[in-house]
Structure formats: C-alpha cells, structure tokens
Interface confidence: low
C-alpha cells in the first residue's frame, strides 16, 4: 500500500530526527513499551509490523553511527545529579515569586486581560504565544520551532511589554515590566541551562524505568498525529498529483483536523508549521512548552484570559516540569546509591 509506505517513511524520518538511540532501543526491546506505543499511535497491525521492521534497521544504523550513546547517557546523568539541587532551589524561588506577582495582579485589577500579546517571533501560526521552548530545541535544527535561539529574548520582551503596557497601567511599584520579564527569563534560563548541556541527548538521561509509560505513549501520540496529518493531506481535494510530503508546510486551507487530546501536541496546535520542525511535545520532552497565552483561534476561540490566571499558569507549568525533573533526580540518586 503506497499510502502506508509513505507514512512509514515519515515515521522513520521522525524517529531519526526526534528520538534518541536509547529511547528507540527502549521502545524496541521492551514488549510492554512497544505495545503501549502501538496503542497510543493507534496503528493498524500491518502498519505496526511494517514500522517495527523499519525501526529494526534504523536502530542498527543509529548504533553504528553513535557507538558511544550509552556512555553519553551516563555523562548527562552525572551532570544532572550534580547540578539539579541548585537549579531546583532557584526555580522554586522563581515559581514562588511568579505566584506572588499573580496574587498581586488579582488584588489590584481583577478584570484585566492580556491583549495583543502575540509576538511574531514567538507565535505558532494562528496566534498561540509559546513562551517556553525548551525541549523543542534539542530536537530541531534551524526550524521554526527552535525557540531558544538568538532573538528569543526579544520576542519575550515584546510579549511582556504587551502585558505590562497599556492594558495594565496600575502605577504600583511591585508590578513592573522588569519584574515579570526577569522572573520568566530567569526561569527560562534555569531550564535552558539543563537543555543546553543535554543538547540532543536530553532523552538519553530520561530513559528511566519510571518514565517508560509516558515516553512510549508520548512518541505514540506524535506518530498518531503525524499519521492523521498524512491521511488528511491525502484527502485534500486539490492536493497535487505528486502528493505533498509531510515535510512541507501544511497550510490552514489543507483541511487538517487533528483530534484533541489531554496533552495537546504541537502538531495539534499548529497549521502553519513544518512537521519536520515539530518536536515530540509529549512527556519525554521534560523541558516542555509552557504556554503563556492561549490566544489560539482554533483551540480557544476568542478566549481572553486574565493576566493573573496566565501568570499562575506559567508558574504551574514550571512547577510541573520541576516536579518531573525532581522525580528523575530521585530515581537517579537511588540508582547511584545501589
């Protein structure tokens, strides 16, 4: 089936670019992990078998290319064990301060909303402002979703200027553009520090027994979204005879409709993004995307959120990431003590 083989090609491309050697091996050597992946990806039996064979070959290629993958994982784990306690206390402090800031906003002006915050360098397609991009960068090169890049700070500054300008002129000392800006930027920097060290091998140090469930279902959800995007591309009436590749931009007119899931994948939130630039945004990217503003036309039609709520959301998202990292830290520590 040509449709099926095109999907397999796309899936292999995804695995090559987005999934570490260690995670691919985990998926292929653990039956439970594989079954979880197949279920999450909603793959028919024949496609699952075909993909399995293709991944078998890919795994061998990846190992030949990256003979030191295991040693690298150990190096990252050691670094994380050493550095995490400091990062944790700094992040906790930032989260506390963000919450205090949110409480202050609420008291001063309960009805204030965030308006016109969408900054070109940070928005994905139709107006989602994605503030924190750590977790994307390690998996994409030169793509439109590599947010932690030179110029990102400018985008955040622009966004926060929007928040702190005309729509909330409280004249209160505690609420300043600098404060909000500094807090979020500092939090980003802490997580960025982890991201920069781990580089493309972030998932090497996340391959811990406790994460297998989320890891496999995370990859599965992205493959499912990719498969559906592919299927929907095929059904577009004016699709070119040569069949557009998934690696080409999907336009808003393409009719792509992806099912909403509990943890929205970037694939599900974007219409104007290259699929090759879309990193897996499910669990195993612990340094996941934190959304400052849900101003998306196709996720929250016309919704305008209160500033305080949005700041709380940032704090909550940061806290969730911190909790996951903290859990990994505990697992790694226990391993070390054996």
């Amino acid at each position: 089936d040509p449709e099926s083989s095109i999907f397999i090609e796309d899936a292999i491309k995804y695995f090559k670019e987005k999934v570490s050697t260690q995670n691919l091996l985990l998926l292929l050597t653990d039956n439970e992990a594989w079954n979880g992946f197949v279920a999450a990806a909603e793959l028919p039996r024949n496609e699952a078998d075909e993909l399995r064979k293709a991944l078998d070959n890919l795994a061998r290629q990846m190992i030949m290319k990256d003979k030191n993958w295991h040693d690298k994982g150990q190096q990252y784990r050691n670094w994380f064990l050493k550095e995490f306690p400091r990062l944790k206390s700094e992040l906790e402090d930032n989260i506390r301060r963000l919450r205090a800031l949110a409480d202050g906003v609420q008291k001063v002006h309960k009805g204030t909303t965030i308006a016109n915050v969408v900054s070109g360098s940070l928005s994905i397609s139709s107006g989602i402002l994605t503030l924190v991009g750590m977790g994307l960068a390690p998996f994409t090169e030169g793509g439109s979703l590599v947010l932690l890049e030179p110029g990102m700070e400018l985008g955040i500054t622009a966004a926060l200027t929007g928040i702190t300008s005309s729509t909330m002129d409280y004249g209160k000392k505690w609420w300043t553009q600098a404060q909000a800006h500094d807090l979020v930027i500092k939090s980003l920097d802490k997580l960025k520090e982890v991201r920069e060290f781990l580089g493309e091998n972030i998932s090497n140090f996340l391959s811990l027994a406790g994460n297998t469930y989320q890891l496999t279902r995370g990859i599965g959800k992205d493959i499912r979204a990719l498969r559906r995007a592919r299927a929907n591309l095929q059904s577009v009436p004016h699709a070119s005879a040569s069949r557009p590749r998934v690696t080409e931009p999907i336009s808003a007119e393409s009719g792509e409709q992806v099912e909403r899931v509990n943890e929205p994948s970037i694939l599900e939130m974007s219409r104007g993004v290259k699929l090759t630039d879309v990193a897996p945004v499910s669990f195993f990217l612990v340094l996941d995307v934190v959304y400052l503003v849900y101003e998306s036309k196709h996720l929250h039609e016309g919704a305008k959120s209160e500033t305080a709520e949005e700041l709380k959301k940032v704090a909550q998202e940061l806290e969730e990431k911190l909790n996951i990292l903290n859990n990994n830290y505990k697992i790694l520590q226990a391993d070390q003590e054996l």
Partner: antibody, heavy 121, light 111 residues
Framework: CQSLEESGGRLVTPGTPLTLTCTVS????????MGWVRQAPGKGLEWIGI?????STHYASWAKGRFTISKTSTTVDLKITSPTTEDTATYFC?????????????????WGQGTLVTVSS | AIEMTQTASPVSAAVGGTVTINCQAS??????LAWYQQKPGQRPKLLIY???TLESGVPSRFKGSGSGTEYTLTISDLECDDAATYYC?????????????FGGGTEVVVK
C-alpha cells in the same frame, strides 16, 4: 567493586523445583541485562536466557517453559521448574556489558563463579 | 532457530604461531557476535564483542572478524597462557528463536 554470586545449587531429585539466586553487588540492575548460562561437566557453555534492564526476558528455545528468570533490585533468580538429570551442570550468572541491548547484542563481561546443581534420584 | 557451529577441537599451534577459529551462525546475526576464553575450572572471559571490538584489557593479539553468518577469531603470537577453550556467542536475541547462543567450543593447544 562489582561482583556476582550464585547460590542455591544443591542435589535435588528429578521433578523438584529449584531456584538459583544471583546476588549482585555494586550493579544497578535497571541499567544492565543479566543472563544465565550453564555448563554440564566436561561439556560446553549452554545459554539459558536473559532478563533485560527493563525486565523483559528471552529464553533459548529449549529452555522455554523449563526455566523462569526474574529479578529484584539486587538479585536475579533462575527457577528450574521441573529438573531432570540432564539439568545437572554448573550454572553461571553473567552481567551484560554496559549498553548491551537486543540491537547491539548481549555480551557478558562479568561472571559469577557458578553454582553446581546435581539432579539425581 | 539460530544454531552456532564452531571449528572442531582441538586446534594446535606452536608458541609464537597463529591459530584461526571459525564460527558459523545458521542465519545472519548482524555482527552481534562475541568470543570468550575459558580455562578449566574457571569462569568464561569476554575477549571480543560486536564481531571485532576488543574488550578492554584484552591483548591486541586477539582479533575478531566477519559479518552475516561467518565469523573468525585469530590469535597471533601464541603464548602458553592462550591454551584454553574458545567459544563464540551470538548476541542477537529476539525475532528468531535460539537453540544455544554459544558455539560448541574449540580447544586450543599450544605446543
């Protein structure tokens, strides 16, 4: 210092289930695959099976149903469900190299001293 | 099921000489092959894995080669201490059933 020590080997009568235990020291069993290999007196090495770091098991075709491998955080067990006289051998527990997987191949670079199982009526 | 077949024992050579031991898998094992040395009353020792990679601490006199179904262990500049039984082992488990991952063993006698 990393080490493996097998225990539980003894004289048993045919049909009496026997569990051999490999106690590991200084080894994180969630990072390494572990295998069981046996050697009958004067014969060659015979692979029984392995348990991967994630806990999945692979057995030699002749060993399926006759042996069960399981693990805790510090031990790896080999249960001989219904021993016969042909199961008389020294049983070795072995740890796979770091990074050993189904794709890189499982290679054993650390071995226990072995424990002798004698099955006789 | 995958079967491993080794050169018949014994193989003998003089000190300073070279011995070659062959190992054949009944189907491709994708270079997932190891060689072990075992002396009487001792546990096996890993020499080579991945068909040709030398385990740390093993002298470079030991050389592994081969791919697919055919593999070779070559011991050059033989020493008395090399007298032992050598086993090949398929590290490729899964997909195909395996009767015994180990070959039958080849005894090397150093004269």
């Amino acid at each position: 210092c990393q080490s493996l020590e097998e225990s539980g080997g003894r004289l048993v009568t045919p049909g009496t289930p026997l569990t051999l235990t490999c106690t590991v020291s200084g080894i994180d069993l969630s990072s390494y695959a572990m295998g069981w290999v046996r050697q009958a007196p004067g014969k060659g090495l015979e692979w029984i099976g392995i348990i991967s770091s994630s806990g999945s098991t692979h057995y030699a075709s002749w060993a399926k149903g006759r042996f069960t491998i399981s693990k805790t955080s510090t031990t790896v067990d080999l249960k001989i469900t219904s021993p016969t006289t042909e199961d008389t051998a020294t049983y070795f527990c072995a740890r796979a190299r770091a990074g050993s997987t189904y794709y890189t191949g499982y290679y054993f670079n650390l071995w226990g001293q072995g424990t002798l199982v004698t099955v006789s009526s | 099921a995958i079967e491993m077949t080794q050169t018949a024992s014994p193989v003998s050579a003089a000190v300073g000489g070279t011995v070659t031991i062959n190992c054949q898998a009944s189907e491709s094992i994708y270079s997932n092959l190891a060689w072990y040395q075992q002396k009487p009353g001792q546990r096996p020792k890993l020499l080579i894995y991945g068909a040709s990679t030398l385990e740390s601490g093993v002298p470079s006199r030991f050389k592994g080669s081969g791919s697919g179904t055919e593999y070779t262990l070559t011991i050059s500049d033989l020493e008395c201490d090399d007298a032992a039984t050598y086993y090949c082992q398929s590290g490729y488990y899964g997909i195909s059933a395996i009767n015994n991952a180990f070959g039958g063993g080849t005894e090397v006698v150093v004269k």
